[in-house]
């Protein structure tokens, strides 16, 4: 039920001339702006008898007539004070005022909740002139009211820099309950309590709430909005919604799914992005997260060579970016790789294992017993060495790389020679006489070039000197030998 506080009417002298509701039928308006048609009448409460001037803002005219009588104060007449109607209905309400003809260019503006209504509103102002006064009726119509039309409407008129304001007309749009807060989807831990909130408003109030779980009502008695439902815990997924009831009917919220957090599904599509001698870059597609964000992942690497120990290495990494570089692997080896990821509940099963291989490595040891001597008769430098003890992982030896640097009188020149795998000796032409030649040798596989041997130096004299002893790789800790021949 609507309770309306009615104002007491205060007597004011009536303006001369006709007023709305008592216009003669032969009076036609000077100006009539058509209003939108199709509205339906609504329930209206009028605080006073029609035709009385209101008690709001009043302008006292300063002008006096020929007889020097003061003009009565200007004020909007009382009209309906409170309109209650249902959503989507039409409504029309108005303000009226009688203005002495001595005032020109009077305009009436409509305001709602302190803001002027401009533009696309159906506001019509009609003027009914008489000998001394003009009756002005300002109408405002809304063809299909919405909740946003709720509020306090007033008319304003400016005369002589004075503002005349009408009493407010309260529009109350009633309808089905409107949700201001609906329950939200949640992911919850099994058998753990959680809360859902539902809030709806009228008018009309009060709004009562019923909770629904999987199509069945949870509470026998309604709760006044807002309502908080405490669910003691779930063991399986459930759908919750709430019903909001008022005198106009009921509105049902969206149904929200409450999921039970679980361990994730295993990752899928583990794939090899890149492989080197000692590392493998993998990527994977995460499985379903079990309604709980992934925290981290574990990469399990198992030696898979047919005759390997089978050692298992476990590398932990962040869940993103679904990419990991596995390091410290043996060259030319096979590995089985699986990925598992965890959320707050626990670890997923391991992905399907994939087989990956590292590539051939570069040799890890330099050639041994490098010996260099000058063969003056052929103007060559002879180099000899022993094949390094290559590990199986180093792959197949494909040859050797010989670096020889020639230094003389401030000039230095480095040359590189490639030698086949079967050799353990090489012959290089003397490049410069009266110079030092520094030789280093490295073993080469398809995996790359291994470390170079310690440098061995030999002095190449000017023509005519005699060749005797070779120069060889120094014992550890000795200075580089320089052999003067």
């Amino acid at each position: 039920a609507i309770t309306e506080a009615r104002e007491e009417a205060k007597p004011y002298p009536l303006f001369p001339g006709p007023f709305p509701g008592s216009l003669q039928t032969d009076h036609t308006p000077l100006l009539s702006l058509p209003h939108a048609s199709g509205y339906q009448p609504a329930l209206m409460f009028s605080p006073t008898q029609p035709g009385r001037p209101h008690t709001g803002n009043v302008a006292i005219p300063q002008v006096t007539s020929v007889e020097s009588k003061p003009l009565p104060p200007l004020a909007f007449k009382h009209t309906v004070g409170h309109i209650i109607l249902s959503e989507h209905k039409g409504v029309k309400f108005n303000c009226s005022i009688s203005v002495p003809n001595i005032y020109q260019d009077t305009t009436i503006s409509w305001w709602k909740d302190g803001k002027e209504l401009l533009g696309a509103h159906h506001a019509i102002t009609q003027f009914y002139p008489d000998d001394e006064v003009t009756a002005i009726i300002a109408s405002f119509s809304i063809t299909s009211v919405q909740r946003s039309d709720n509020g306090s409407y007033i008319c304003k008129m400016k005369i002589n820099n004075e503002e005349i304001v009408s009493d407010p007309i309260y529009i109350e749009v009633q309808g089905l309950p409107h949700f201001t807060k609906q329950p939200e989807s949640m992911n919850v831990t099994r058998n753990t309590a959680f809360n859902l909130t539902c809030q709806a408003v009228g008018p009309p109030e009060p709004v009562n709430i019923f909770w629904v779980q999987n199509s069945s009502r949870v509470n026998e008695q309604p709760e006044k909005s807002p309502s908080v439902l405490t669910v003691p815990g779930l063991t399986e997924m459930a759908v919750f919604s709430c019903e909001a009831h008022n005198d106009k009917g009921l509105t049902v919220s969206k149904g929200v799914q409450i999921n039970i957090k679980a361990i994730p599904s295993p990752p899928t599509e583990v794939s090899i992005r890149n492989s080197t001698a000692h590392s493998i870059l993998i990527s994977w597609v995460p499985g379903f997260d079990g309604y709980s964000p992934f925290r981290n992942c574990s990469i399990q690497v198992k030696e898979a060579d047919p005759l390997s120990n089978g050692s298992v290495m476990i590398f932990n990494t962040s869940a993103l970016p679904h990419l990991y570089q596995i390091k410290q692997l043996q060259a030319l080896a096979n590995y089985s790789i699986g990925v598992s990821c965890m959320n707050e509940i626990g670890w997923s099963a391991v992905s399907p294992w994939i087989l990956a291989s590292t590539t051939e490595g570069a040799p890890s040891v330099a050639p041994l017993n490098v010996t260099v001597f000058l063969n003056e008769s052929s103007d060559n430098v002879d180099i000899r060495w022993m094949k390094p003890p290559t590990k199986q992982q180093d792959g197949e030896l494909v040859g050797y790389r010989i670096s020889h640097v020639w230094q003389s009188a401030g000039i230095s020149k480095e040359l590189l020679e490639e030698v086949g795998q079967n050799g353990s000796r090489a012959r290089i032409s003397v490049q410069v006489h009266n110079a030092t030649c520094t030789v280093r040798i490295a073993a080469v596989t398809r995996g790359g070039v291994g470390p170079f041997s310690d440098p061995v130096k030999i002095f190449i004299p000017a023509h005519g000197w005699v060749d005797y002893a070779p120069s060889s790789t120094p014992a550890p800790g000795n200075a580089d030998p320089v052999l003067i021949i």
């Epitope: 060579d305 005759l307 390997s308 089978g310 294992w353």
Partner: antibody
């Protein structure tokens, strides 16, 4: 020290099945492949297959796919090889060995005879 | 399957001699070749892994060499306790395959 304990002998009837065990100790059971080999009297060695106790991953010699089934029991650090539908051809010494085959069991002599 | 051919099938030597046992693979096995010794009524024992890597506890007179398809086990100064059958094994691909063995006899 690393030990792989196998029963010395098993006598079974043709057509039956047998489960040969290999109990491991002295190392981390789940960190090494367990291999099984067959050696018939006066003959060479044959590789049957391997199992990884970490995840029960297996590889079999195709020749033994329908004959042997490899399993492990992590709780007791024991590997098993089940041989089915036994015939006299299955009479042999069966060895378990780990990793790079650096450690071997003593072997189980299986005799399939009625 | 990779076939391993061992030669000779039998070798008769005098203690103190040096012997070489050969193992040839039907394809390159990239040094993934291992040598075992099996004495009479005993389990096999790993002597050399990856063609030439020595094994802790194995006498230094046992050495291995080779790459690609051809591999050799050498026993320097043979001792009486070296009388056994020697097997090579490829660990390059599954199934693992053993050679037929070389029987080393002492005169």
């Amino acid at each position: 020290q690393v030990q792989l304990q196998q029963p010395g002998a098993e006598l079974v009837k043709p057509g039956a099945s047998v489960k040969v065990s290999c109990k491991a100790s002295g190392y981390t059971f789940t960190n090494y492949w367990m291999h099984w080999m067959k050696q018939r009297p006066g003959q060479g060695l044959e590789w049957i297959g391997r199992i990884h106790p970490f995840d029960s991953d297996t590889n079999y010699n195709e020749k033994f796919t329908d004959k042997a089934t490899l399993t492990v029991d992590k709780s007791s650090s024991t590997a098993y090889m089940q041989l089915s539908s036994l015939t006299s051809e299955d009479s042999a010494v069966y060895y378990c060995a780990i990793g790079t085959l650096i450690y071997w069991g003593q072997g189980t002599t299986l005799t399939a005879s009625s | 399957d990779i076939l391993l051919t061992q030669s000779p099938a039998t070798l008769s030597v005098t203690p103190g001699e040096t012997v070489s046992l050969s193992c040839r693979a039907s394809q390159s096995i990239y040094k993934k070749l291992h040598w075992f010794q099996q004495r009479s009524h005993r389990s096999p024992r790993l002597l050399i892994k990856f063609a030439s890597d020595s094994i802790s506890g194995i006498p230094s007179r046992f050495t291995g060499s080779g790459s690609g398809t051809d591999y050799t086990l050498s026993i320097n100064s043979v001792k009486p306790e070296d009388e056994a059958i020697y097997y090579c094994l490829q660990g390059y691909s599954t199934p693992l395959t053993f050679g037929a063995g070389t029987k080393l006899e002492l005169k």
